[in-house]
Amino acid sequence: KNLKSPQKVEVDIIDDNFILRWNRSDESVGNVTFSFDYQKTGMDNWIKLSGCQNITSTKCNFSSLKLNVYEEIKLRIRAEKENTSSWYEVDSFTPFRKAQIGPPEVHLEAEDKAIVIHISPGTKDSVMWALDGLSFTYSLVIWKNSSGVEERIENIYSRHKIYKLSPETTYCLKVKAALLTSWKIGVYSPVHCIKTTVENELPPPENIEVSVQNQNYVLKWDYTYANMTFQVQWLHAFLKRNPGNHLYKWKQIPDCENVKTTQCVFPQNVFQKGIYLLRVQASDGNNTSFWSEEIKFDTEIQAFLLPPVFNIRSLSDSFHIYIGAPKQSGNTPVIQDYPLIYEIIFWENTSNAERKIIEKKTDVTVPNLKPLTVYCVKARAHTMDEKLNKSSVFSDAVCEKTKPGNTSK
């Protein structure tokens, strides 16, 4: 009886694992083995595919074959018993194009209200992704084990920290890789779960802000308790993108080590031009807080994010405020080519109860004012990128008197 060729050959490539699967064409014939040959582009001869000779099952692995993953190859298969079937040719393919990104390796660390996720490619020193190793980005899905409500986080790098979690709570997550340059989305990792710790006695510092005064940077933060010491560290932001790096060498800012106030001042020349991450930690001598949320600090933006200038048109029950570009020395306006949001603080001159307005527009109405009353206004600009978290210092306060009644038209 003539042996039939095997059919429906599928090539599965995940990272550096090359798997072939096929269907037997005749289930009734026993003791059949299968063998593959391969052919590279531009070659006439067929070569035996090592790892896929005389196979009794319908699956084989040819990962040991050292192929150029960018070069097209062709495969053929036949069945063998006493005689052999005819060859069945598989459509030619390029391994790199066909390859899927495998599940990444995930390592979790827990704090009381945060989880640190370290992600690395599932195949170390992969041949398939050798030229793309630095281009991996990751996305994850996280949920509370008790609720199952999922949150997706896109475009993260090999280390990511998720904040604002609950203490003593189990969170589960899965991660997948992507190579956006090649339009490839990977396979999810297995689910990893970790329980956050008991609540720490000392909370981390909050609301870290950097501003410029003279030739110095002023770093300020909020803290719940008094009589604490603080330390501030910095890291080059690009290091977070380095996939092989499991050790982030955070560095002390010398003038911000063991400070006893909720701010520190250090010279601008401490940092060369670039983007940095900053974090603050509190200690009371016995206990240490976890680190604060990391803020992104761009020296370029920081240096040029100046307080806005504004004009006030006074009415009886409101002020119209017109915000213009800040002036640098020489009275020339500064072009700020990134979107800003404005924080306007106003108060009655005789009181210190402040009110606040946050506005994206450059013309702002301050409503509900009393006639013939002096109000003072100051403003500052913030970048709209949450991660960048840049703020100018406040402008000088400008005080104006509202008009008498019935002038609001």
């Epitope: 979790l108 560095k251 976890f290």
Partner: antibody, heavy 118, light 107 residues
């Protein structure tokens, strides 16, 4: 493969100084921290300090501040621990270890015995 | 400094027994705890990092758990080569510290 090889045993007199070395191979010393740990005979492990060989930044346990000096020479992948004003209770084994972030001290040297005796 | 206590300080056990060693820290250290095994005259051998992850080549009978201030090392079935001293280590904040050790010997 990754290895940390420490210098040989030393015998010193009280008041003298000693400088121990720890040579790394199979990895780039600049990408890690090198830590030093002491262990008295029959006792536990005690952390002395660490160095970032890339920029020579150091941290010390308060107890060793001023008496221990950790340095590194990246050109020969070697870290050093110098101990001054040796006392008889400095008769201990000193270990170096490679620190790798969340992996902690993932490789250790074989240890160097320092004997302080008059 | 973060203080670390280990219990028990010594433990006599038999091959095949399940053993649990506990380690307490004086403050919350997250999951920044490692465990090392040391035999006389030898350097410490890394077993567990980040509370619960086994180093490559460490047998699966060793496991770690815990977080915050309470950590445990478990040997599910003690083997003859496991008789040694075990140390926990916190690397959350400087100065790094070690537990005083737990000596595991044959009953």
């Amino acid at each position: 493969q990754v290895q940390l090889v420490q210098s040989g045993a030393e015998v010193k007199k009280p008041g003298a100084s000693v400088k121990l070395s720890c040579k790394g191979s199979g990895f780039n010393i600049k990408d890690y921290y090198i830590h030093w740990v002491k262990q008295a005979p029959g006792q536990g492990l005690e952390w002395i300090g660490r160095i970032d060989p890339e920029d020579a930044e150091t941290k010390y346990a308060p107890k060793f501040q001023g008496r221990a000096t950790i340095t590194a020479d990246t050109s020969i992948s070697t870290a050093y621990l110098e101990l001054s004003r040796l006392r008889s209770d400095d008769t201990v084994v000193y270990y170096c270890g490679r620190y790798h972030g969340y992996w902690a001290l993932d490789y250790w040297g074989q240890g160097t015995l320092v004997t302080v005796s008059s | 400094d973060i203080q670390m206590t280990q219990s028990p300080s010594s433990l006599s056990t038999s091959v095949g027994d399940r053993v649990t060693i506990t380690c307490k820290t004086s403050q919350n250290v997250g999951t920044n705890v490692a465990w090392y095994q040391q035999k006389p005259g030898k350097a410490p051998k890394p077993l567990i990092y980040s509370t619960s992850y086994r180093y490559s080549g460490v047998p699966s009978r060793f496991s770690g758990s815990g977080s915050g201030t309470d950590f445990t090392l478990t040997i599910s079935s003690v083997q003859p080569e496991d008789f040694a001293t075990y140390y926990c280590h916190q690397y959350f904040s400087y100065p790094y510290t070690f537990g005083p050790g737990t000596k595991l010997d044959i009953k």
